[in-house]
Interface confidence: low
Amino acid sequence: SGVFQLQLQEFINERGVLASGRPCEPGCRTFFRVCLKHFQAVVSPGPCTFGTVSTPVLGTNSFAVRDDSSGGGRNPLQLPFNFTWPGTFSLIIEAWHAPGDDLRPEALPPDALISKIAIQGSLAVGQNWLLDEQTSTLTRLRYSYRVICSDNYYGDNCSRLCKKRNDHFGHYVCQPDGNLSCLPGWTGEYCQQPICLSGCHEQNGYCSKPAECLCRPGWQGRLCNECIPHNGCRHGTCSTPWQCTCDEGWGGLFCDQDLNYCTHHSPCKNGATCSNSGQRSYTCTCRPGYTGVDCELELSECDSNPCRNGGSCKDQEDGYHCLCPPGYYGLHCEHSTLSCADSPCFNGGSCRERNQGANYACECPPNFTGSNCEKKVDRCTSNPCANGGQCLNRGPSRMCRCRPGFTGTYCELHVSDCARNPCAHGGTCHDLENGLMCTCPAGFSGRRCEVRTSIDACASSPCFNRATCYTDLSTDTFVCNCPYGFVGSRCEFPVGLPPSFPW
């Protein structure tokens, strides 16, 4: 689409006569008719295939035609066309005398023609005017002409449509040849594709406007290069979305099972020593004077039997006091006033003199102890039972009564609740402090994986266009990580309009 423009500049008719030679009365009131048509080797009458235009009366006899384009007038004359400019044309310009105000052809006498010129040739699209002058016996016409493209049309033939825009459908201006020139921040054939924030991850990020970086499901961070770990992942990290790789000292599906409970929680009180013994499991070895699973319970000082040689212990506000039997003295009744002559050794113990008879020592038979063999051996005094087991004296020996979940001579072994394979359908068993937990394979659920449920959400390959599928174990659904150029919950849509809500 374009416009053939004809600028009339000067018409000379000095004698003021018509083509027939007859003079105009009182002078030749001159207007012009223009016919633009396809190229003809010999310009002949017929349809003005490219268009026609007429002027009002522009002057009398000889006159100059002023440029009226700036004021919205009719010079240059406009002959618009809505086809590809062929590069060649034929042009007929007729000058007519208007005796009255009616300029219609049928209203004019046949001999009102003043002059007629016809030219033909090649004409390229361009801004430059071609100046021409045509002279006949009685008249002379000076004019110039050119072909320019209409707004939004470009190229050698005005055949290339280009309209600058800055909306959903493109962000560009037009070059002189009609090619698109993208606005800053946009790219692609139609400048529809935003250039994302520099460094925005090619696969994991996308944008709907320039310098933006929006993350696909499973990714986060300014450049969408940080994966989001599995929902509920407590002490773990990921290298791909929805993973949960446990930090040192943590285990379990969600890295929430403490394998280093002692360090993380310091459960043992009153200076006790802590030992890890499995997931969320630990043992506290208490300092003298304390007891309980966490050594939280302070013993009465007399409970540790500090008084020797049959002395009796009394609690006092500031500690304890030993009441010694006859023949003994000292803070713990540890000193004797007796000798072997006094037969101080009980329960068959044999007496040995010491320090030239000033003191003695008893050698006790099995199962008896004490400086006078007065005490039956309590094989439980050393707290041999681990994991909170209860020590029981059984004659010459001892035994440990273990808490649930422990076994062994000293309750030192953790009973595996998993030993009896309680998890159905190939579930994986995990020992916990208060029982067990089954991690079920895809398609099964329930405390023991006994319930058949939906299969792995990704098994049906729900993602299109070579997208990567991730199973969200917490919701039993899938998430598709789309390759560049696709969107949608299954990556089924090619990128078209930018989403209206770029979260």
């Epitope: 929006l214 993350c215 696909r216 499901p217 986060q220 961070g221 940080e226 989001i228 770990p229 929902n231 509920g232 992942c233 407590r234 919701t475 969107v487 949608g488 919950s489 849509f493 989403p499 209206s500 809500f501 979260w503």
Partner: antibody, heavy 120, light 108 residues
Framework: QVQLQESGPGLVKPSQTLSLTCTVS??????????WSWIRQHPGKGLEWIGY???????HYNPSLKSRLSISIDTSKIQFSLKLSSVTAADTAVYYC????????????WGQGTLVTVSS | EIVLTQSPGTLSLSPGERATLSCRAS???????LAWYQQKPGQAPRLLIF???SRATGIPDRFSGSGSGTDFTLTISRLEPEDFAVYYC?????????FGGGTKVEIK
């Protein structure tokens, strides 16, 4: 299992500021994978989304309430909060807090809701 | 903002019957970002469907969602006594997030 619990005064005077807190248990509020939203329901009516906050502190508000609204997050206390200023009787509603997965703003987890009445 | 219109306002049916609830959007909901919720008196809404057709965890398969663009449907294939409640649709493809006015499913 993630649980959300709203707390705050049940009665607010007109022109004052309504303040509510949502405490999250059984899950990390500091995970980048979620948006934490407030939603309200006028008595006997439908639901209206108020706005959300991300653990990074980013917020997005309903334009109809934006000029009066502030939502913040305190990851150390595992809480996020709502402040709505210059309240009128039209703000009387049950206020819910809820969790949405990042990029997909449907609400899989909700608090039980708390009724706030605006009256003098 | 996208306005969601639910119809009918009330649906009176008997247990065992099929319920079809409609949600129409004032403009296209991008990527079928539409969810359905169930709400019983005195309780918070409960997520049933997201992404127009994906069932949430623990939701029975008698609940199904369909549709795209501006027309969406929630179907309850066979009503159980516990299904009588108010149902809301919600779009999350455009800001602000908006909910429909609700459809009450009551016992006939």
């Amino acid at each position: 299992q993630v649980q959300l619990q709203e707390s705050g005064p049940g009665l607010v005077k007109p022109s004052q500021t309504l303040s509510l807190t949502c405490t999250v248990s059984g899950g990390s509020i500091g995970s980048g994978g979620y948006y934490w939203s407030w939603i309200r329901q006028h008595p006997g009516k439908g639901l209206e989304w108020i706005g959300y906050v991300h653990y990074s502190g980013n917020t997005h508000y309903n334009p109809s309430l934006k000029s009066r609204l502030s939502i913040s997050i305190d990851t150390s206390k595992i809480q996020f909060s709502l402040k709505l200023s210059s309240v009128t009787a039209a703000d009387t509603a049950v206020y819910y807090c809820a969790r949405a997965p990042r990029g997909y703003h449907y609400f899989a987890y909700w608090g039980q809701g708390t009724l706030v009445t605006v009256s003098s | 903002e996208i306005v969601l219109t639910q119809s009918p306002g009330t649906l009176s049916l008997s247990p065992g019957e099929r319920a079809t609830l409609s949600c129409r959007a004032s403009q296209s909901v991008s990527s079928s970002y539409l969810a359905w919720y169930q709400q019983k008196p005195g309780q918070a809404p409960r997520l049933l469907i997201f992404g127009a057709s994906s069932r949430a965890t623990g939701i029975p398969d008698r609940f199904s969602g369909s549709g795209s663009g501006t027309d969406f449907t929630l179907t309850i294939s066979r009503l159980e006594p516990e299904d009588f409640a108010v149902y809301y649709c919600q779009q999350y493809g455009s800001s602000p997030l908006t909910f429909g006015g609700g459809t009450k499913v009551e016992i006939k």
